[in-house]
C-alpha cells in the first residue's frame, strides 16, 4: 500500500501517512523559578511544569532540565507566552524630571540547541521597552511560529530578567510545541 | 487495514488515520456586544459572529450562546485576539499629579467549561496594565496554545471590561480553535 | 480504498487522506526593506527572506514579490510578528505639556489578495497606540489565526510605517503560513 494512492489528481507522491494523535506534543506551564547560577550577558532559561494541571508532554516529546527534547524530525509549531510584572522603573522617574532615558526592557527568546552545533539558535524573540509610571505594571509577550527541527534538537525559553516573570498562574506564562 | 502499516521503522503503533479536512474547526469574529447581566467579580463573556465574513464553523464544531462546543476529544490549538480601546484612564491623571496609582488593566481569559466539573478552567490569560496618557489608546492582547479537550467541553472568551472591546472590525477581535 | 474505512464509530466519511509532510508551508523572515513607491492611505507591504537562515517555503508554497502564493485550497494557520522601534513621538512631548493628543500608532495587517476579487481582504489586524516617553521605544505586534483560503490566493503583510520596522534580526519580525 503506497502513500500515493491517496494523492489528488496531480499525482504528487506523499510521505508515509501518520495518525495525528501520535504526534509529539507538549504544553508546559510556569512554576516558581529556583535559584541557579546566572552567567553575565546570557539570558537565563525558565524551567517548567510538565505534568500537573494544564501541562502535558506526549508521544516521546520529553521535558528535562529546562529543555523540550524533539524526538522526531519535522515541522513544529512552537509558542510561548511570558507575563512580566514589576514596579515603577527608574526610567519613569528620570523621564518625569524631563530627561528621557534609554528605557528598561523585557525580552523573551525561544532558543534551539543542537548538540552538533556550537551556538544556540534564536528562533523567536519578543522584546519590548518598558517605561511605566504606575506603581505596578504587568504585561505579556507572546510568540509563536513554525520551524523545521531535527530529532535531538532541544528547545528552551530564555528571558531578559527572570526576577520579573509572573509565576503565579499556569495560564499566564507557558511554553509549547507540536509536530505539524 | 491497520494503522501501523504506515509506521516508520521504529514500528510505533498509530491510532486510526484521519483526513485533515474533516477536523472540527472554527474562527469566530467580533460583533457589537449586547447588554447582558454581569456578575460581580466575574469577567463577562464575549459573543461572536460564526458564519458571516471571515467567520466559520465546520465539521461539527458548533457555536452557541457565547460558547464553542467541542465535538470530539483531542488536542486543540485555541487562540484569540481582543483589541481594546479607551480614553485616558484615571491612572494617568493621578500619576500626572505625582501620585503613582495601581494601574488600570485589561485582561482576556480563554475559559473551558466542563459540565461535569463545577468550576470553569482558565486555559489562557493575557493581562496588561494600562496607564496611558494620550486621549485615545488602543491595543490588542493575543493568546494561543494547545490543550487536551474532551467531547462536550465548551470554550468562551472572557474580558475584564466588555465596554472597552473594539467591535468595529472582524480582523481586530477574534476567537478560534482547531483539532490538531 | 475509501476514506471512510478509517472513520470512527459514527461512520463519518472522510476526505482523502493526506501525509502531513507534504503540506504547503512557509516561514519568512525580515530583511532590510528596499525603497518602493507607497500610495497614500495604503499601508506598504513588507518583503521577506524565504530561503536563508530560518526561512523556508516548501510543498508548492511559493514566495514572490512580497506575496505568499497559496497552492492549494484549504484551511491555513497564518501568523506574523512585526517588531517596531522608534524614538520619542511628538505625542509624548505634547502630552507632557498637558495637552493630550491623538496618539501615534503602529499597525500590522495580514492581507489576502484574490485575483478574481477587486478588493484585498484584511484577515488580521494588530494595532496599538504608541505614546512613549523614553528616548527609544520598541515593541512587537503578534498575529495568528486560521482562515479558509483558495488556490491562487496571495498573502502579504502590511504595516503602518515601514520605516519603524525592526529588520535587524530574523527572530524579531517574521511571517508564516501552513495548511492544516
Amino acid at each position: 500500500l503506497k502513500g500515493q494512492e491517496f494523492a489528488p489528481s496531480h499525482q504528487q507522491v506523499y510521505a508515509p501517512l501518520r495518525a495525528d494523535g501520535d504526534k509529539p506534543r507538549a504544553h508546559l506551564t510556569v512554576v516558581r523559578q529556583t535559584p541557579t547560577q546566572h552567567f553575565k550577558n546570557q539570558f537565563p532559561a525558565l524551567h517548567w511544569e510538565h505534568e500537573l494541571g494544564l501541562a502535558f508532554t506526549k508521544n516521546r516529546m520529553n521535558y528535562t532540565n529546562k529543555f523540550l527534547l524533539i524526538p522526531e524530525s519535522g515541522d513544529y509549531f512552537i509558542y510561548s507566552q511570558v507575563t512580566f510584572r514589576g514596579m515603577t522603573s527608574e526610567c519613569s522617574e528620570i523621564r518625569q524630571a524631563g530627561r528621557p532615558n534609554k528605557p528598561d526592557s523585557i525580552t523573551v527568546v525561544i532558543t534551539k540547541v543542537t548538540d552538533s552545533y556550537p551556538e544556540p539558535t534564536q528562533l523567536l524573540m519578543g522584546t519590548k521597552s518598558v517605561c511605566e509610571v504606575g506603581s505596578n505594571w504587568f504585561q505579556p509577550i507572546y510568540l509563536g511560529a513554525m520551524f523545521s527541527l531535527q530529532e535531538g534538537d532541544k528547545l528552551m525559553v530564555n528571558v531578559s530578567d527572570i526576577s520579573l516573570v509572573d509565576y503565579t498562574k499556569e495560564d499566564k506564562t507557558f511554553f509549547g510545541a507540536f509536530l505539524l | 487495514l491497520k494503522g501501523q502499516e504506515f509506521a516508520p521503522s521504529h514500528q510505533q503503533v498509530y491510532a486510526p488515520l484521519r483526513a485533515d479536512g474533516d477536523k472540527p474547526r472554527a474562527h469566530l469574529t467580533v460583533v457589537r456586544q449586547t447588554p447582558t447581566q454581569h456578575f460581580k467579580n466575574q469577567f463577562p463573556a464575549l459573543h461572536w459572529e460564526h458564519e458571516l465574513g471571515l467567520a466559520f464553523t465546520k465539521n461539527r464544531m458548533n457555536y452557541t450562546n457565547k460558547f464553542l462546543l467541542i465535538p470530539e476529544s483531542g488536542d486543540y490549538f485555541i487562540y484569540s485576539q481582543v483589541t481594546f480601546r479607551g480614553m485616558t484612564s484615571e491612572c494617568s491623571e493621578i500619576r500626572q499629579a505625582g501620585r503613582p496609582n495601581k494601574p488600570d488593566s485589561i485582561t482576556v481569559v480563554i475559559t473551558k467549561v466542563t459540565d461535569s466539573y463545577p468550576e470553569p478552567t482558565q486555559l489562557l490569560m493575557g493581562t496588561k496594565s494600562v496607564c496611558e496618557v494620550g486621549s485615545n489608546w488602543f491595543q490588542p492582547i493575543y493568546l494561543g496554545a494547545m490543550f487536551s479537550l474532551q467531547e462536550g467541553d465548551k470554550l468562551m472568551v472572557n474580558v475584564s471590561d466588555i465596554s472597552l472591546v473594539d467591535y468595529t472590525k472582524e480582523d481586530k477581535t477574534f476567537f478560534g480553535a482547531f483539532l490538531l | 480504498l475509501k476514506g471512510q474505512e478509517f472513520a470512527p464509530s459514527h461512520q463519518q466519511v472522510y476526505a482523502p487522506l493526506r501525509a502531513d509532510g507534504d503540506k504547503p508551508r512557509a516561514h519568512l523572515t525580515v530583511v532590510r526593506q528596499t525603497p518602493t513607491q507607497h500610495f497614500k492611505n495604503q499601508f506598504p507591504a513588507l518583503h521577506w527572506e524565504h530561503e536563508l537562515g530560518l526561512a523556508f517555503t516548501k510543498n508548492r508554497m511559493n514566495y514572490t514579490n512580497k506575496f505568499l502564493l497559496i497552492p492549494e485550497s484549504g484551511d491555513y494557520f497564518i501568523y506574523s510578528q512585526v517588531t517596531f522601534r522608534g524614538m520619542t513621538s511628538e505625542c509624548s512631548e505634547i502630552r507632557q505639556a498637558g495637552r493630550p493628543n491623538k496618539p501615534d500608532s503602529i499597525t500590522v495587517v495580514i492581507t489576502k489578495v484574490t485575483d478574481s476579487y477587486p478588493e484585498p481582504t484584511q484577515l488580521l489586524m494588530g494595532t496599538k497606540s504608541v505614546c512613549e516617553v523614553g528616548s527609544n521605544w520598541f515593541q512587537p505586534i503578534y498575529l495568528g489565526a486560521m482562515f479558509s483560503l483558495q488556490e491562487g490566493d496571495k498573502l502579504m503583510v502590511n504595516v503602518s510605517d515601514i520605516s519603524l520596522v525592526d529588520y535587524t534580526k530574523e527572530d524579531k519580525t517574521f511571517f508564516g503560513a501552513f495548511l492544516l
Epitope: 516558581r32 522603573s89 505596578n136 530578567d161 526576577s163 | - | -
Partner: antibody, heavy 120, light 107 residues
C-alpha cells in the same frame, strides 16, 4: 547554614544620612533577591525595598522612594541600604531578608536587625 | 496597595489549645500568602508560604489554609514556644504588604 548580619544602625539627626550593610553567608548570594524590611518600635512589619539577584531591578516603598537606595555587591556577598534625608518616622529596626528568584515573593531568612533612631 | 487585615489582634490561649488566626486581603491574592512568627527582640521566622506549604524545619502543628481573600493559620496544639506575634504577608502584587499582627499570649 544561612546567615544574615546587619550593621550600620545608630542614632542620627533628621535630614542626615546613614548606610546599612547586611553580610550574607551560607548560600549563593548572587542567586537571590534581597529585601529590607523595617519595624517601628511596638509596631508591625513594613517592607522597604528589594533588589533583584543581579542588581538590575530595585523597587521601593512609596514612603522611602527618592530618599533610600538599595544596592548589592555580589563579589562581597553584601547588601546595602543608603538612607538619605532621614525623618523621625524612619526610626525602626531594619532587617535584611532573603527573598527568592522573583523579586515579589516570600522571605525565608531574616537577619537579627539593626536599630536606626532618627532624633534631634 | 493590597491591605492585609489580621484578626484578632490579641489572642489569649493555654498550652494544648487549638489556635486559629485569620488574615483577610482587600482583594484576591490567590494562594500567594506567607505566615511569620516573631518573638520579642528577635527577627521574624517563616512558617508557611504559598498559603499552605510548611517551611522546612517548622513543626507540623502549624498549618495554613485558604485562598482568594480569606486565610487562616492554625496551631493544632499550642506549645510554650509558640507564644509570639504572628504576621501574614501577601506577595501577589507590588508592594508586598503585611498584616498588622496577632499576638498570642498566655491565658
Amino acid at each position: 547554614q544561612v546567615q544574615l548580619v546587619e550593621s550600620g544602625g545608630g542614632v542620627v539627626q533628621p535630614g542626615r544620612s546613614l548606610r546599612l550593610s547586611c553580610a550574607a553567608s551560607g548560600f549563593t548570594f548572587s542567586s537571590y533577591a534581597m529585601h529590607w524590611v523595617r519595624q517601628a518600635p511596638g509596631k508591625g512589619l513594613e517592607w522597604v525595598a528589594v533588589i533583584s539577584y543581579d542588581g538590575s531591578n530595585k523597587y521601593y516603598a512609596d514612603s522611602v522612594k527618592g530618599r533610600f537606595t538599595i544596592s548589592r555587591d555580589n563579589s562581597k556577598n553584601t547588601l546595602y541600604l543608603q538612607m538619605n534625608s532621614l525623618r523621625a518616622e524612619d526610626t525602626a529596626v531594619y532587617y535584611c531578608a532573603r527573598g527568592q528568584v522573583a523579586i515579589l515573593d516570600y522571605f525565608d531568612y531574616w537577619g537579627q536587625g539593626t536599630l536606626v533612631t532618627v532624633s534631634s | 496597595d493590597i491591605q492585609m487585615t489580621q484578626s484578632p489582634s490579641t489572642l489569649s490561649a493555654s498550652v494544648g489549645d487549638r489556635v486559629t488566626i485569620t488574615c483577610r486581603a482587600s482583594q484576591s491574592i490567590s494562594s500567594w500568602l506567607a505566615w511569620y512568627q516573631q518573638k520579642p527582640g528577635k527577627a521574624p521566622k517563616l512558617l508557611i508560604y504559598d498559603a499552605s506549604s510548611l517551611e522546612s524545619g517548622v513543626p507540623s502543628r502549624f498549618s495554613g489554609s485558604g485562598s482568594g481573600t480569606e486565610f487562616t493559620l492554625t496551631i493544632s496544639s499550642l506549645q510554650p514556644d509558640d507564644f509570639a506575634t504572628y504576621y501574614c504577608q501577601q506577595y501577589n502584587s507590588y508592594p508586598p504588604t503585611f498584616g498588622g499582627g496577632t499576638k498570642v499570649e498566655i491565658k
